[in-house]
Interface confidence: low
């Protein structure tokens, strides 16, 4: 007869593991007893269990409570084992010693492999404000064994920088995602994305980028100078620009104070029925806690009665 | 223990504004993503925004963006949320939550009591 | 914005029985959903994360499942203390947007 067993049982950390050891034997032959023994190298033989096949399962009180026979329907020669809510230190290697009757004693080893999933950890970098350089976006940490793969899923584009620390059971990889803030990046998914084999599916962790920035401002209202004449009501100035932080807006009047009856709502500047005295130049002062931006235009009300007699002058001319 | 702890509840004129405090207790305030989230009588959950209590980055829903503003005070790991001209329809109870470790852009893993706002002329 | 439908709006159901609520998304949100939990006057309270990992603390009768837009919450075993509205959440994508919630009421 043989032994039949594993080269390597991989499991996950808090999972069963079941270690398995099969005696296929000829016609009448009987398995008296299995002992399982863990033999690390250089550390000796210590005794998880002794399976008999009279007196049934003994374990050893280093691993009471932790090694069971598999449930029934078991089969005689059926030496296997299950090693309960597996952790890091039960990696290593493992040896059944099957007794028989009457061809005598068998042993096989097997390498148990206990896969510690990452627990990964995302952790923003500083503020990302327009105009700055390369800068860190955010770093993910995964520490497991084997040592887990971190990689980025983004449709922004940047660098990535990989380093790993080993330690004594596992080993801990930090990615960091670089890149040039523009206010394009703005409410982007930065997804970590962590790969090993005692997941079932790769983690992935989600950070959404925030970007400050301002843009530049400018004065929407004067496309048309003749609309801006003595008596017209409603003329009215809007600051346009955008930002993140939403932007907060602010007009003056460069060459004075702004004439009475002048509204200022927000970004929008109101006047009231234009007079000459509305004629000046007007500034927008567009600010966040990232920048500010400042845009002037000047207003010049035209006297409908000076224009037609500069037409007439114009005719009489010629 | 985690805990969250908001002001109390308010009753406010329509077009004023109210300021709601969240005082954290129990981990790393600066660690950790506080959203704000309302909830009007009888209705479902709506997520307002966030700030970040470390670097006081805020990004809100668009629906409240200009009317709504989220501070911090890190040396008492408190988070505000003030909301500006207030309508009938702002009557919610809003409340503040933290931002898981793992998943600390958009799952909530504690929650303040509420705050009830009532908007009434 | 994301669209997060939930079916049923509320239901009737006995203690000890099993209970399937299910939330819909208006585009693929792979398995960024999320579940809650909230009793009349209280706060919500998180159940469920990632689609199918259960909070710390939660009992283990409940479950989630799903990935894409279709998502299910399992409760297999209907206890007293679960009589509540449950809300499903979107974390794909900023405005992070809820579920219209489900009211599980006794039958």
């Known amino acids: 007869g043989e032994l039949e067993t594993s080269d390597v049982v991989t499991v996950v950390l808090g999972q069963d593991a079941k270690l398995p050891c099969f005696y296929r034997g000829d016609s009448g032959e009987q398995v008296g007893q299995v002992a399982w023994a863990r033999v690390d190298a250089g550390e000796g033989a210590q005794e998880l269990a002794l399976l008999h096949s009279k007196y049934g399962l003994h374990v050893s009180p280093a691993y009471e409570g932790r090694v069971e026979q598999p449930p029934p329907p078991r089969n005689p020669l059926d030496g296997s084992v299950l090693l309960r809510n597996a952790v890091q230190a039960d990696e290593g290697e493992y040896e059944c010693r099957v007794s028989t009757f009457p061809a005598g004693s068998f042993q096989a080893r097997l390498r148990l492999r206990v896969l510690v999933p990452p627990l990964p950890s995302l952790n923003p970098g500083p503020a990302l404000e327009e105009g700055q350089g390369l800068t860190l976006a955010a770093s993910c940490t995964a520490e497991g064994s084997p040592a887990p793969s971190v990689t980025w899923d983004t449709e922004v584009k940047g660098t990535t920088s990989s380093r790993s620390f080993k330690h004594s059971r596992s080993a801990a990889v930090t990615s960091e995602f670089h890149l040039v803030p523009s206010r394009s990046m703005n409410g982007q998914p930065l997804t970590c994305v962590v790969s090993h084999p005692g997941l079932l599916q790769d983690q992935r962790i989600t950070h959404i980028l925030h970007v400050s920035f301002l843009a530049e401002a400018s004065v929407r209202g004067l496309e048309d100078q003749n609309l801006w004449h003595i008596g017209r009501e409603g003329a009215m100035l809007k600051c346009l620009s955008e930002g993140q932080p939403p932007p907060s807006y602010n007009w003056t009047r460069l060459d004075g104070p702004l004439p009475s009856g002048v509204r200022v709502d927000g970004d929008t500047l109101g006047f009231p029925p234009l007079t000459t005295e509305h004629s000046g130049i007007y500034v927008c002062h567009v600010s966040n806690e990232f920048s500010s931006r400042d845009s002037q235009v000047t207003v010049d009300v035209l006297d409908p009665q000076e224009d037609s007699g500069k037409q007439v002058d114009l005719v009489s001319a010629s | 223990e985690v805990q969250l702890v908001q002001s109390g509840a308010e009753v406010k004129k329509p077009g004023s504004s109210v300021k709601v405090s969240c005082k954290a207790s129990?981990?790393?305030?600066?660690?950790?993503?506080m959203h704000w989230v309302r909830q009007a009588p009888g209705q479902g959950l709506e997520w307002m925004g966030w700030?970040?209590?470390?670097?006081?980055?805020?990004n809100y829903a668009q629906k409240f963006q200009g009317r709504v503003t989220m501070t911090r005070d890190t040396s008492i790991s408190t988070a505000y949320m003030e909301l500006r001209s207030l309508r009938s329809d702002d009557t919610a109870v809003y409340y503040c939550?933290?931002?898981?470790?793992?998943?600390?852009?958009?799952?909530?893993?504690?929650w303040g009591q509420g705050t009830l706002v009532t908007v009434s002329s | 914005d994301i669209v997060m439908t939930q079916s049923p709006s509320s239901l009737s159901a006995s203690v000890g029985d099993r209970v399937t609520i299910t939330c819909r998304a208006s585009?693929?949100?792979?398995?960024?959903l999320n579940w809650y939990q909230q009793k009349p006057g209280k706060a919500p309270k998180l159940l469920i994360y990632?689609?199918?990992s259960l909070q710390s603390g939660v009992p283990s009768r409940f479950s989630g499942s799903g990935s894409g837009t279709d998502f299910t919450l399992t409760i297999s075993s209907l206890q007293p203390e679960d009589f509540a509205t449950y809300y499903c959440?979107?974390?794909?994508?900023?405005?992070?947007?809820f579920g219209q919630g489900t009211k599980v009421e006794i039958k």
């Open positions: 959440q979107q974390s794909y994508s900023t405005p992070l947007t």
């Open positions: 585009q693929s949100i792979s398995s960024y």
């Open positions: 939550a933290r931002g898981s470790a793992l998943h600390f852009f958009g799952v909530f893993d504690y």
């Open positions: 700030i970040n209590p470390n670097s006081g980055g805020t």
């Open positions: 990632a689609a199918s």
């Open positions: 129990g981990y790393t305030f600066t660690g950790y993503y």
